[in-house]
C-alpha cells in the first residue's frame, strides 16, 4: 500500500519527519511580520493546481565511471566529470523524421545502440506497455530488421554490451545482436496466468516494486527470471467505464489475492545466453527454493548477483517473520546451481516482520564471498552488518539511537550510505562513508554542506563510485550538487533553484515547524506547516494530514509545494503530520508496536496527536480536521469513527475499510492470517464499519475512483453502505475510471478543488 | 570421509516406540538437511521426514504425521527419529540420508536400521 | 502429493546395451527429479539431479533428461556392476516421493 505516486510532489507519500530545523530562508516571510503590511500574493489552489511554480530537477544517468547522459532543451547531453566538460550526445533533431513521440530512452552499456521507447500505455503502478526501436549510433540510423513487437511489456540492455532481453505476452525473448532474430526462451507465458520475467499483479505492488523479474549476471552470459503462477489466483472485477459511447461497460479482472486468500506460486529459473541456439529450445535450470520455505506458502523477495557465476537468493514465509537467503553457485560439471545449506542465512524477527517491507538486499564484495545488508540490531535499530558466506553470525559495523536507511555504494575501501543519525532527527537523509578497514572512521559527506538549507539527501554514484550527485531536496529549495568520491570534493552545482527562489520572493510562503512531543517517555515527531505571519498568540484551524502505515515517515526535511502550501498560504491553515507508533526509521519499538494491530495504537495516536496539538494554544480546537489518502484514508475514517469528540470533520480518500478486502501480501505482513487460528477475531475488529455509529457526530467526505486496481472500490462501497444503514448523513464522491492515484489532469483538479471547498466550509472559511 | 551410521532398530510390539539415531561424520549436520526415508521389505523408497538443525525446522509425511518425531543434536553431530504408536505398516529399513545443497536431494545415505514392528 | 510413476518395472539387458527408464510425475515438477541406484543389501546412491545434472563420480555413462511431468534415465552402455533397481524422486514439493522403482536385470 503506497500512497499515490502521481500526485505532485508526492503529498500523500509516506515521508516526512523533521525536527526544529531552522527554516529555510526561502520559506520565510520577507520584510515584515505584519500580514496586513504584506502586499505579495499568497500561493494559491490554482498555483498547485497549475504547476504555477515548478521545481526544477536535474536528472542524470551514468553510463561510466566518470560521464552521465542528461537532457537540455531535448538534446541528450554526456558530461565528463573528468575534464568538466559537456558535450552533445545526441541531438534533439535526431528523431524528427522518427513519426512517434518518444517517451523514454536507453543506451547499450557499450554506447553502440539506443532503444526507443513510444506507445506507453500504462497497466498498474510500474507495470506498462509499449513498442521500441533501436537506433545504431555508429550508423546513425534506425534498425528495421527483427524489430522488437508492439506491446512489449518489459526491455532491458545487458550490463555489458549490447544484449537485450524482453517479455512479450508474458514470456520471455532474448536478443544477442539487435538486428538478428530473437532467441526465445520461455514457451509458458500466459495473459493472467503465468507470468515469466514479469510480475504479477502483488508481486509487482508489494514485493518487487517493479514490473520486471528478469535479471542479467553482471557480464550478460546468464540470464535469471521467476515464473509466477497465478492459476488459482481469485479475480477482482470492475467495470470500465470507458467513452460515453460504450454502451456496456468493460469489466476489468486482474488475479489480485485478498487476505488469506490463495496466492500466486512462484518459480525461479536461470538460463546461459551465450549457449542459445536456433536448433534447439534454450534450457532454463531452475534452482528450487529451500526446503524450510517448499514446506509452505513463500514468496521470492530479492534477487542480486554477486559474481560472474554466484547469485543469491532471498525467500520469505507467507508469514512474513522468516525469510532465507540462498547463496548459489554455478557448476559446470553438471550445469546446475548448487545452493549450499551452509550458505543459508536466516532472517528472522520476535517482534514483528523482516524488513522494513522486505528483506533488504545484500551488497556483496568484489569476490562473492562477503556481503553487508541492513538488518535490525539487538536493540532494534536497523543497521549494517558484514557477512561472510560461509559464517552464520555476521558483524555490525553502525551502530545507534538511529537509522541506516540505505547502502548507496560499496568499493574497496569504503561502503556509502544513507542515514538519519544527523543531530538525533529520524526525518533527517545524510550520506556518510565507513572505511572498511577500520569500522570506526565514519565521515558524513553531506552534513555539513550547507546545513540551513539542506537536512535531507540522495545520491547518485557513477559507475564504480568515483563521483557522486548529491540531491538536497530540503528543508530548503532543491539543490543538486556534482562530487568527487576521491577527496569528496564539491566539484560543481548543477541546479540550484535560483530561478524558483526569485519568483517566491513575491509569494507570502508558509513556513514549517519540524519538533517532538514525548509520549510515555518516547520522541514522536511531527511537523507544521504553518500560515504565513503566524502569529503564536491568534489560533488557526488544523488540518491532520495523515497516513500512518507501518514504516512511514510524514515529518521530514522535505521541500514541498503543494495542496497543504495552499491551504496554510492562502487559507490560514496550519496543516501538521504526526508519526506515531508504527512510523518508520526509529527503530523496532516503535515500528513494531502495531504488529498484528492494524487500526490501533497508530490510529489512536493521531488523536492524542491532535489533542496535545490543541494545547499549544494557537489551535482553534473547535476546527481541527482530518484527512489521508490509501492508508491515510484507513485512519482518518477510524479516527473519525472512534468518537473522540477532537476532529470536526474530515476525508477519507481512497480507503482500506477492512483488512480482508486488501492484497495478501502487505496485510498479512503486519496482519497474519485471517483465520480463527490465527488473528480473525482482530480483522473483524479493525473495520472502518463497525464504526458506522460514531459519524453521526462528524462530516465526513468520501472519495474513491472506480477503477481502482489497488485499493478497491468495494472498500469504500461498503463504507458507504454501513453508513447509510444506520442513518449517517455523509458527503461522497466518486471518480469515474480512476485508479489509487486519482491521478489524471481533469480528475486531480476536480478532487482537490471540491477537497477544499469541503475544508474551507468545514472551517466557516469564505 | 563422510558417514551416517544409523543405530536403535529392532523388533518391537504394535504400539510400542523406538528412538533411531543417526550419527553423522566427516560433516556437520548444521551444514545440511537430514532425511529420513523407509524401505518395507521387498518395496520401493518411502520419504519419512526431514530436518535442518540449524533452522529448527521440520517435515513429516502424512503416514507418520503425529506420531513420528526428528531431531537434532548439533553438539553430538546427530540426528534422532522418535517413532511412537507404531504399526505393523511401519516394519522397514530406516536409512538417514543428507543433503549440503539446499534442494531436498539426498547426496549420501546411511546403511539403514531395521525396524521390524510385530506382536 | 505429487505420484512419479515408473516404467518398465523392471527390464532384462545385456552388458552393453542401451537402457532407459522412464519416470512419469503426476504433475508438473520442472526439472526437479533425482535418480538414485540401489543394490541388493545397500543404500541407494545418488546418480542425477535437476533432471540431467550428473553428480560428482558418477559415471558419464548415466545421463538424465526431461522437464515438466515426463522423465527419463539413460545408461548409453550397460556395465555389469549396473544391474540394479533404480528410483526416480522428485523434489519440486513436500512430501517427497519416490517413483516404486524399475529392477535392471541379467538378460
Known amino acids: 500500500m503506497k500512497t499515490p505516486w502521481k500526485v505532485l510532489l508526492g503529498l500523500l507519500g509516506a515521508a516526512a519527519l523533521v525536527t526544529i530545523i531552522t527554516v529555510p530562508v526561502v520559506l520565510l516571510n520577507k520584510g515584515t511580520d505584519d500580514a496586513t503590511a504584506d502586499s505579495r500574493k499568497t500561493y494559491t489552489l490554482t498555483d498547485y493546481l497549475k504547476n504555477t511554480y515548478r521545481l526544477k530537477l536535474y536528472s542524470l544517468r551514468w553510463i561510466s565511471d566518470h560521464e552521465y547522459l542528461y537532457k537540455q532543451e531535448n538534446n541528450i547531453l554526456v558530461f565528463n566529470a573528468e575534464y568538466g566538460n559537456s558535450s552533445v550526445f545526441l541531438e534533439n533533431s535526431t528523431f524528427d523524421e522518427f513519426g512517434h513521440s518518444i517517451n523514454d530512452y536507453s543506451i547499450s552499456p557499450d554506447g553502440q545502440f539506443i532503444l526507443l521507447e513510444y506507445n506507453y500505455v500504462k497497466q498498474w503502478r510500474h507495470s506498462y506497455t509499449a513498442s521500441y526501436d533501436i537506433y545504431d549510433l555508429n550508423k546513425r540510423q534506425l534498425i528495421t530488421e527483427e524489430r522488437i513487437p508492439n506491446n512489449t511489456q518489459w526491455v532491458t540492455w545487458s550490463p555489458v554490451g549490447h544484449k537485450l532481453a524482453y517479455v512479450w505476452n508474458n514470456d520471455i525473448y532474448v536478443k544477442i545482436e539487435p538486428n538478428l532474430p530473437s532467441y526465445r526462451i520461455t514457451w509458458t507465458g500466459k495473459e493472467d496466468i503465468i507470468y515469466n520475467g514479469i510480475t504479477d499483479w502483488v508481486y509487482e505492488e508489494e514485493v518487487f516494486s517493479a514490473y520486471s523479474a528478469l535479471w542479467w549476471s553482471p557480464n550478460g552470459t546468464f540470464l535469471a527470471y521467476a515464473q509466477f503462477n497465478d492459476t488459482e489466483v481469485p479475480l477482482i472485477e470492475y467495470s470500465f467505464y470507458s467513452d460515453e459511447s460504450l454502451q456496456y461497460p468493460k469489466t476489468v479482472r486482474v488475479p489480485y489475492p485478498k487476505a488469506g486468500a490463495v496466492n500466486p506460486t512462484v518459480k525461479f529459473f536461470v538460463v546461459n545466453t551465450d549457449s542459445l541456439s536456433s536448433v534447439t529450445n534454450a534450457t532454463s535450470i531452475q534452482i528450487t527454493a529451500p526446503a524450510s520455505m517448499l514446506i509452505g506458502d513463500h514468496y521470492l523477495c530479492d534477487v542480486t548477483w554477486a559474481t560472474q557465476e554466484r547469485i543469491s537468493l532471498q525467500w520469505l514465509r507467507r508469514i512474513q517473520n522468516y525469510s532465507v537467503m540462498d547463496i548459489c553457485d554455478y557448476d559446470e560439471s553438471s550445469g546446475r546451481w548448487n545452493c549450499l545449506v551452509a550458505r543459508q542465512h536466516i532472517e528472522m524477527s520476535t517482534t514483528g516482520w523482516v524488513g522494513r517491507f522486505r528483506p533488504s538486499e545484500p551488497h556483496f564484495t568484489l569476490d562473492g564471498n562477503s556481503f553487508y545488508k541492513i538488518i535490525s540490531n539487538e536493540e532494534g535499530y536497523r543497521h549494517i552488518c558484514y557477512f561472510q558466506i560461509d559464517k552464520k553470525d555476521c558483524t555490525f559495523i553502525t551502530k545507534g539511537t538511529w537509522e541506516v536507511i540505505g547502502i548507496e555504494a560499496l568499493t574497496s575501501d569504503y561502503l556509502y550510505y544513507i542515514s538519519n543519525e544527523y543531530k538525533g532527527m529520524p526525518g533527517g537523509r545524510n550520506l556518510y562513508k565507513i572505511q572498511l578497514s577500520d569500522y570506526t572512521k565514519v565521515t558524513c559527506l553531506s552534513c555539513e554542506l550547507n546545513p540551513e538549507r539542506c537536512q535531507y539527501y540522495s545520491v547518485s554514484f557513477s559507475k564504480e563510485a568515483k563521483y557522486y550527485q548529491l540531491r538536497c531536496s530540503g528543508p530548503g529549495l532543491p539543490l543538486y550538487t556534482l562530487h568527487s568520491s576521491v577527496n569528496d570534493k564539491g566539484l560543481r552545482v548543477l541546479e540550484d533553484n535560483s530561478a524558483l527562489d526569485k519568483m517566491l520572493q513575491n509569494v507570502q510562503m508558509p513556513s514549517k515547524k519540524l519538533d517532538f512531543i514525548i509520549l510515555n517517555e518516547t520522541k514522536f515527531w511531527y511537523q507544521m506547516i504553518l500560515p504565513p505571519h503566524f502569529d503564536k498568540s491568534k489560533k488557526y484551524p488544523l488540518l491532520l494530514d495523515v497516513y500512518a502505515g507501518p514504516c512511514s515517515q510524514k515529518a521530514d526535511t522535505v521541500f514541498r509545494l503543494n495542496w497543504a502550501t495552499y491551504l496554510a498560504s492562502t487559507e490560514n491553515i496550519i496543516v501538521a503530520s504526526f508519526d506515531g507508533r508504527g512510523s518508520g526509521y526509529q527503530g523496532d519499538k516503535i515500528m513494531h508496536a502495531i504488529n498484528r494491530r492494524l487500526g490501533t495504537f497508530e490510529v489512536e495516536d493521531q488523536i492524542e496527536a491532535a489533542r496535545q496539538f490543541s494545547k499549544m494554544g494557537f489551535v482553534d480546537n473547535k476546527r481541527i480536521a482530518i484527512w489521508g489518502w490509501s492508508y491515510g484514508g484507513y485512519v482518518t475514517s477510524m479516527v473519525l469513527g472512534s468518537g473522540s469528540g477532537v476532529f470536526k470533520c474530515g476525508i477519507a480518500v481512497a480507503p482500506v475499510s477492512r483488512w480482508e478486502y486488501y492484497d495478501s501480501v502487505y496485510t498479512e505482513r503486519y496482519m497474519g492470517l485471517p483465520t480463527p487460528e490465527d488473528n480473525l477475531d482482530h480483522y473483524r475488529n479493525s473495520t472502518v464499519m463497525s464504526r458506522a455509529e460514531n459519524f453521526k457526530q462528524v462530516e465526513y467526505l468520501l472519495i474513491h475512483g472506480t477503477a481502482d486496481d489497488n485499493v478497491h472500490f468495494q472498500q469504500s462501497a461498503q463504507i458507504s453502505k454501513a453508513l447509510v444503514d444506520v442513518g449517517v448523513d455523509f458527503q461522497a464522491m466518486w471518480y469515474t475510471d480512476e485508479d489509487h492515484g486519482i491521478a489524471s489532469s481533469t480528475a486531480h483538479q476536480h478532487i482537490y478543488t471540491h477537497m477544499s471547498h469541503f475544508i474551507k466550509q468545514c472551517f466557516s472559511l469564505p | 570421509e563422510v558417514q551416517l551410521v544409523e543405530s536403535g532398530g529392532g523388533l518391537v510390539q504394535p504400539g510400542g516406540s523406538l528412538r533411531l539415531s543417526c550419527a553423522a561424520s566427516?560433516?556437520?549436520?548444521?551444514?545440511?538437511?537430514i532425511h529420513w526415508v523407509r524401505q518395507a521389505p521387498g518395496k520401493g523408497l518411502e520419504w519419512v521426514a526431514w530436518?535442518?538443525?540449524?533452522?529448527?525446522?521440520?517435515y513429516y509425511a502424512d503416514s507418520v504425521k503425529g506420531r513420528f518425531t526428528i531431531s537434532a543434536d548439533t553438539s553430538k553431530n546427530t540426528a534422532y527419529l522418535q517413532m511412537n504408536s507404531l504399526r505393523a505398516e511401519d516394519t522397514a529399513v530406516y536409512y538417514c540420508?543428507?543433503?549440503?545443497?539446499?534442494?531436498?536431494?539426498?547426496?549420501?545415505w546411511g546403511q539403514g536400521t531395521l525396524v521390524t514392528v510385530s506382536s | 502429493d505429487i505420484q512419479m510413476t515408473q516404467s518398465p518395472s523392471s527390464l532384462s539387458a545385456s552388458v552393453g546395451d542401451r537402457v532407459t527408464i522412464t519416470c512419469r510425475a503426476s504433475?508438473?515438477?520442472?526439472?526437479?527429479v533425482a535418480w538414485y541406484q540401489q543394490k541388493p543389501g545397500k543404500a541407494p546412491k545418488l546418480l542425477i539431479f535437476?533432471?540431467?545434472g550428473l553428480y560428482s563420480g558418477v559415471p558419464s555413462r548415466f545421463s538424465g533428461s526431461g522437464s515438466g511431468t515426463d522423465f527419463t534415465l539413460t545408461i548409453s552402455s550397460l556395465q555389469p556392476e549396473d544391474f540394479a533397481t533404480y528410483y526416480c524422486?522428485?523434489?519440486?514439493?513436500?512430501?517427497?516421493?519416490f517413483g516404486q522403482g524399475t529392477k535392471v536385470e541379467t538378460k
Open positions: 530436518i535442518w538443525p540449524y533452522g529448527g525446522f521440520t
Open positions: 524422486q522428485q523434489y519440486s514439493s513436500y512430501p517427497l516421493t
Open positions: 504433475q508438473d515438477v520442472n526439472s526437479n
Open positions: 535437476g533432471s540431467g
Open positions: 540420508a543428507r543433503f549440503l545443497g539446499s534442494s531436498s536431494i539426498m547426496d549420501y
Open positions: 566427516g560433516f556437520t549436520i548444521n551444514d545440511s538437511y
